[in-house]
C-alpha cells in the first residue's frame, strides 16, 4: 500500500512571536511530503502547506483571524515519488499538534526604544509600537492595539557611571522619569503581560540605548516605518 513507507510527523511545535506563527515538526522527509491542517475547536479543518517537503508551515494567516481562539493543527504524511506506485487506499498517517491560543501563548518580540528626550531633570522614553499581522477592517494592528491594557512595558535605567538599576512601568508606550541633572543614563525596556503566568509573560530586553555626553542632549534613535 502507498502509506507503508510514510512515517507520521512528530515533535509538532508552535513557534510564535508577535503573532507570526509557524508550526514546526520532524522528521526531515525521505520519500514523503506533508500537508498541514488547522482548525479551531468548533471549525472545519483547513489545509495549508499542501504537499510540502518542508518541516515547517506558516499558519499566521489563519491564527490572526481570531487570536483569542484556540487552534489545533495536524500534519499528514503522504508518499512522494511516482504516484502510480504509491497510490493508496489507506488514510495517511498524521499527528496532532498541541493546542495553541495565540493571545495567551505568542511570545512578545524584543522591543525597541524609539526615542528619548531630556528636558531638565526629566527624560521621556518612547517604546516603538510593533506592528503585527493581525488585521481589523483591512488595517494591520499594532501590539498595543491587540493587547491593550494587558500589555505593559518595564523600563530599566541606570547612570552610565554606576551599575545600580532603577525601574519604571507604563501602561502606554511612554515613560517620563526623573534623572539627575548632568548625569548620563542608559535605558533598556521589556514588554510584559502581567496576567500571564507562564514563561512567555516577558519579552527579552531591548537593546541598550545611552544618552550622549553633553548636558541636556536629546537623542533620536530612529523611527521605523512599516509597510504591509
Amino acid at each position: 500500500s502507498g502509506t507503508t513507507n510514510t512515517v507520521a510527523a512528530y515533535n509538532l511545535t508552535w513557534k510564535s512571536t508577535n503573532f507570526k506563527t509557524i508550526l514546526e515538526w520532524e522528521p526531515k522527509p525521505i520519500n514523503q511530503v506533508y500537508t498541514v491542517q488547522i482548525s479551531t475547536k468548533s471549525g472545519d479543518w483547513k489545509s495549508k502547506c499542501f504537499y510540502t517537503a518542508d518541516t515547517e508551515c506558516d499558519l499566521t494567516d489563519e491564527i490572526v483571524k481570531d487570536v483569542k481562539q484556540t487552534y489545533l493543527a495536524r500534519v499528514f504524511s503522504y508518499p512522494a515519488g511516482h504516484v502510480e506506485s504509491t497510490g493508496s487506499t489507506e488514510e495517511p498517517p498524521y499527528e496532532n499538534s498541541p493546542e495553541f491560543t495565540p493571545y495567551l501563548e505568542t511570545n512578545l518580540g524584543q522591543p525597541t526604544i524609539q526615542s528619548f528626550e531630556q528636558v531638565g531633570t526629566k527624560v521621556n522614553v518612547t517604546v516603538q509600537d510593533e506592528w503585527t499581522l493581525v488585521r481589523r477592517n483591512d488595517t494591520f494592528l499594532s501590539l498595543r492595539d491587540v493587547f491593550g491594557k494587558d500589555l505593559i512595558y518595564t523600563l530599566y535605567y541606570w547612570k552610565s557611571s554606576s551599575s545600580g538599576k532603577k525601574t519604571a512601568k507604563t501602561n502606554t508606550n511612554e515613560f517620563l522619569i526623573d534623572v539627575d541633572k548632568g548625569e548620563n543614563y542608559c535605558f533598556s525596556v521589556q514588554a510584559v503581560i502581567p496576567s500571564r503566568r507562564t514563561a512567555n509573560r516577558k519579552s527579552t530586553d531591548s537593546p541598550v540605548e545611552c544618552m550622549g555626553h553633553e548636558k541636556g542632549e536629546s537623542r533620536e534613535t530612529g523611527h521605523h516605518h512599516h509597510h504591509h
Epitope: 502507498g2 500537508t35 491542517q37 489545509s47 504516484v83 493508496s88 488514510e91
Partner: antibody, heavy 119, light 113 residues
Framework: QVQLVESGGGVVQPGRSLRLSCAAS????????MHWVRQAPGKGLEWVAV????????YYADSVEGRFTISRDNSKNTLYLQMNSLRAEDTAVYYC????????????WGQGTLVTVSS | DIVMTQSPDSLAVSLGERATINCKSS????????????LAWYQQKPGQPPKLLIY???TRESGVPDRFSGSGSGTDFTLTISSLQAEDVAVYYC?????????FGGGTKVEIK
C-alpha cells in the same frame, strides 16, 4: 482506458450556484489526487483546486477560496466542484484532471464543461 | 505564489524547422534534496484539453515524439520542437508543480510560417 467526463456546466446568473461533476473510469480512482483546472475563453490555464486521494485535504486558488468546494465520492468514482457566489470572471471551461507521475502533473484530462456566468 | 512567464507569446516556424519556447519562474522550482525541477510542459490544440508532454523539466511522457525535448534548471526552462510538424500547431504551456498554488505560464502559440 482512463476516462474523465465532466458535466454540470451551463449558463448561470451572477451570485448563483452550480455543481460540476467528473465521472472517472479506467483507473483506481481512490488512489489518485484529483484537480480542477479552468480556462477562460481565449485565455490560459488556471489551477482551481485539488483534493487528495483520501478526500481529507483540499486546497484552493485564492480566486475561489471560500466560494468553491472540491469533494469526491470514492464509492462512485466521482469528483465534484460546488461553485457558489459565481462571478462573471468565473466564466470558463472547467477541466478535471488526475495526478500523474507526481502530485500536480496531469497525465489525463477530461474534455471540459463550459460554465457561463452572465445576467 | 510562483509566477511563470513564457516567451514569446506566439511563434511562426517553417515545417521541419526548430521551435524554441522559453519559460521563466519567479523563484526556483528545483528541489535540492532530489535535484529535480518541478516543471511540466503541456500542448493544447484548439477545442481539446491540454496534453502532458514533459515533466521533471526534461522527461518525456510516454508516447510523446522525441522531437519534443525539455531543458533548463532552477528558474529558466526551454521546450524545443526539433523539427516542426503540421500536427504540432498548438498552444504550449509550462507549469510548476513545486508548490501550491500550482501555476501555469501564459502560453505560447506555435503556428506554421
Amino acid at each position: 482506458q482512463v476516462q474523465l467526463v465532466e458535466s454540470g456546466g451551463g449558463v448561470v446568473q451572477p451570485g448563483r450556484s452550480l455543481r460540476l461533476s467528473c465521472a472517472a473510469s479506467g483507473f483506481t480512482f481512490h488512489s489518485r489526487g484529483m484537480h480542477w483546472v479552468r480556462q477562460a475563453p481565449g485565455k490560459g490555464l488556471e489551477w482551481v483546486a485539488v483534493i487528495t486521494y483520501d478526500g481529507i485535504n483540499k486546497y484552493y486558488a485564492d480566486s475561489v477560496e471560500g466560494r468553491f468546494t472540491i469533494s469526491r465520492d470514492n464509492s462512485k468514482n466521482t469528483l465534484y466542484l460546488q461553485m457558489n457566489s459565481l462571478r462573471a470572471e468565473d466564466t470558463a471551461v472547467y477541466y478535471c484532471a488526475r495526478d500523474g507521475v507526481y502530485y500536480g502533473v496531469y497525465d489525463y484530462w477530461g474534455q471540459g464543461t463550459l460554465v457561463t456566468v452572465s445576467s | 505564489d510562483i509566477v511563470m512567464t513564457q516567451s514569446p507569446d506566439s511563434l511562426a516556424v517553417s515545417l521541419g524547422e526548430r521551435a524554441t519556447i522559453n519559460c521563466k519562474s519567479s523563484q526556483s522550482v528545483l528541489f535540492s534534496s532530489n535535484n529535480k525541477n518541478y516543471l511540466a510542459w503541456y500542448q493544447q490544440k484548439p477545442g481539446q484539453p491540454p496534453k502532458l508532454l514533459i515533466y521533471w523539466a526534461s522527461t518525456r511522457e510516454s508516447g510523446v515524439p522525441d522531437r519534443f525535448s525539455g531543458s533548463g534548471s532552477g528558474t529558466d526552462f526551454t521546450l524545443t520542437i526539433s523539427s516542426l510538424q503540421a500536427e504540432d500547431v498548438a498552444v504550449y504551456y509550462c507549469q510548476q508543480f513545486h508548490s501550491y498554488p500550482l501555476t501555469f505560464g501564459g502560453g505560447t502559440k506555435v503556428e506554421i510560417k
